[in-house]
């Protein structure tokens, strides 16, 4: 899709990066078997995918985490796919929740999010989790991407 | 997308097949409500989707399995989406992990994987799991597919 | 993809709606950050996405639910993506199953379904669950959509 100079393919797939930051926003990198089709989509500050062209995008994220019910808060592990449009407050596009496992020391679980959304030029999408220290960064476990329809 | 003779649609969706083989690579079939757009994508040996054209593809897999913590190994159930490019070693594109359930005789869980990847002509993608005997093959539970952007 | 008047983009993303109906078919609404590209895809009776054009579609659904093993039936929570083509019986395209949590009062879990399917003009897709009262309708938790390739 998006063939020709006027309509280039726009797609990205980035790989999770462990971070010492205490922020709940996950960090990503162009490493391993990543995709970055061209400069019409960019990874900014290692935390958000930003698009230059308006349009419909299929946006997805996968988060694998390892947690234990006793060692975690009562609240479930929640992953959120969020949007920040220029001049607007950020907003949640998609969320998924998984109750912590009773397995010890922790039980791994994977969450997948995906949906079609209209993005404005300069819009950014990012992934937020309740506890980034529980996220699994082994090969292929946690990733984030989009494709323009 | 991919309209016209020069740019045909390329897409596939195949259905899980129970197998007596001991391999960890899942088996698939063109049965039920399957999709195989044309011969630019093929199901080879019932185990891998092979593409003829280079490009960006959204590749996905869904695996439903039924396992029990006591009857299974300590390691979680892991599903991996893997790539084999001509003349290259195989590599993992995506993985998801779910700790086994304490439900008896077994507890069902579903895993979904998906992402955008560049494939070379002749590249094949396949799905690997830690224990194929635990996979659920009821209608719609386990499937595998791709679409070319 | 699908550029120009002859080939408009066709995509939808709708948001879950709590319902007092006892039906197992989930209800959806064009609310929040929804997508409805044009009248070539419509939400009918708040329960099904109906397409006007034949073709290959990537169809997806995400369902978050909260359940407890003791309070639920022995059977797992199952979400099904179903197809109703004109003059045909409905059929299951995709299913996912998750065993109920032992967390109290209930444990949240998320299911994601997605795949590529051929739809005929007038075909409708809908989502069915074993217990709609367990579905979570908080922002972003439960959604349903499609895009035409």
């Amino acid at each position: 899709m998006q063939k020709g100079d006027q309509n280039p393919q726009i797609a990205a797939h980035v790989i999770s990066e462990a971070s010492s930051k205490t922020t709940s926003v996950l960090q990503w990198a162009e490493k391993g078997y990543y995709t970055m089709s061209n400069n019409l989509v960019t990874l900014e500050n290692g935390k958000q995918l930003t698009v230059k062209r308006q349009g419909l995008y299929y946006i997805y994220a996968q988060v694998t985490f390892c947690s234990n019910r006793e060692a975690s808060s009562q609240a479930p592990f929640i992953a959120s796919l969020c949007l920040k449009s220029p001049g607007r407050f950020e907003r949640i596009l998609l969320r998924a929740a998984n109750t912590h496992s009773s397995a010890k020391p922790c039980g791994q679980q994977s969450i997948h999010l995906g949906g079609v959304f209209e993005l404005q030029p300069g819009a950014s999408v990012f992934v937020n989790v309740t506890d980034p220290s529980q996220v699994s960064h082994g090969t292929g476990f946690t990733s984030f991407g989009l494709l323009k329809l | 997308m991919q309209k016209g003779d020069q740019n045909p649609q390329i897409a596939a969706h195949v259905i899980s097949e129970a197998s007596s083989k001991t391999t960890s690579v899942l088996q698939w079939a063109e049965k039920g409500y399957y999709t195989m757009s044309n011969n630019l994508v093929t199901l080879e040996n019932g185990k891998q989707l092979t593409v003829k054209r280079q490009g960006l593809y959204y590749i996905y897999a869904q695996v439903t399995f039924c396992s029990n913590r006591e009857a299974s190994s300590q390691a979680p159930f892991i599903a991996s989406l893997c790539l084999k490019s001509p003349g290259r070693f195989e590599r993992i594109l995506l993985r998801a992990a779910n700790t086994h359930s304490s439900a008896k005789p077994c507890g069902q869980q579903s895993i979904h994987l998906g992402g955008v990847f560049e494939l070379q002509p002749g590249a094949s993608v396949f799905v690997n799991v830690t224990d194929p005997s635990q996979v659920s093959h009821g209608t719609g539970f386990t499937s595998f597919g791709l679409l070319k952007l | 993809m699908q550029k120009g008047d002859q080939n408009p983009q066709i995509a939808a993303h709708v948001i879950s709606e709590a319902s007092s109906k006892t039906t197992s078919v989930l209800q959806w609404a064009e609310k929040g950050y929804y997508t409805m590209s044009n009248n070539l895809v419509t939400l009918e009776n708040g329960k099904q996405l109906t397409v006007k054009r034949q073709g290959l579609y990537y169809i997806y659904a995400q369902v978050t639910f909260c359940s407890n093993r003791e309070a639920s039936s022995q059977a797992p929570f199952i979400a099904s993506l179903c197809l109703k083509s004109p003059g045909r019986f409905e059929r299951i395209l995709l299913r996912a199953a998750n065993t109920h949590s032992s967390a109290k009062p209930c444990g949240q879990q998320s299911i994601h379904l997605g795949g590529v399917f051929e739809l005929q003009p007038g075909a409708s897709v809908f989502v069915n669950v074993t217990d709609p009262s367990q579905v979570s309708h908080g922002t972003g938790f439960t959604s349903f959509g499609l895009l035409k390739l």
Partner: nanobody
Framework: EVQLLESGGGLVQPGGSLRLSCAAS????????MGWVRQAPGKGLEWVST????????YYADSVKGRFTISRDNSKNTLYLQMNSLRAEDTAVYYC?????????????????WGQGTLVTVSS
């Protein structure tokens, strides 16, 4: 820090069998091909066998084909070499090695990390 620790070597009679193991740590095991290289007394290094990252491809030197079997357990980060029908000429120090190659090569310069080795002696 990458570490490769071999075990399982020893003295065995001709025609006998041994199983070598190599415990790996300090890197993502399943991302890399692994191999075995040996050095007979007074001889140079000889490539023995390589296995692809997920075990789908196995490669052997002609001198060991049909007698040796390489395998791996990615869940345990462990590489194995099952040696059957051993001969006196198999006597060597066997090294486990991590490959940096993305496709098969018997060129030992593509192994970027090596273990300390385990001695296999085949003698009556």
């Amino acid at each position: 820090e990458v570490q490769l620790l071999e075990s399982g070597g020893g003295l065995v009679q001709p025609g006998g069998s041994l199983r070598l193991s190599c415990a790996a740590s300090g890197f993502t095991f399943l991302d890399y091909a692994m191999g075995w290289v040996r050095q007979a007394p007074g001889k140079g290094l000889e490539w023995v066998s390589t296995i692809s990252p997920m075990g789908m491809g196995t490669y052997y030197a002609d001198s060991v084909k049909g007698r040796f079997t390489i395998s791996r357990d990615n869940s345990k980060n462990t590489l194995y070499l099952q040696m059957n029908s051993l001969r006196a000429e198999d006597t060597a120090v066997y090294y486990c090695a991590k490959s940096s190659a993305i496709s098969f090569t018997s060129d030992i310069s593509n192994f970027d990390y090596w273990g300390q080795g385990t001695l296999v002696t085949v003698s009556s």
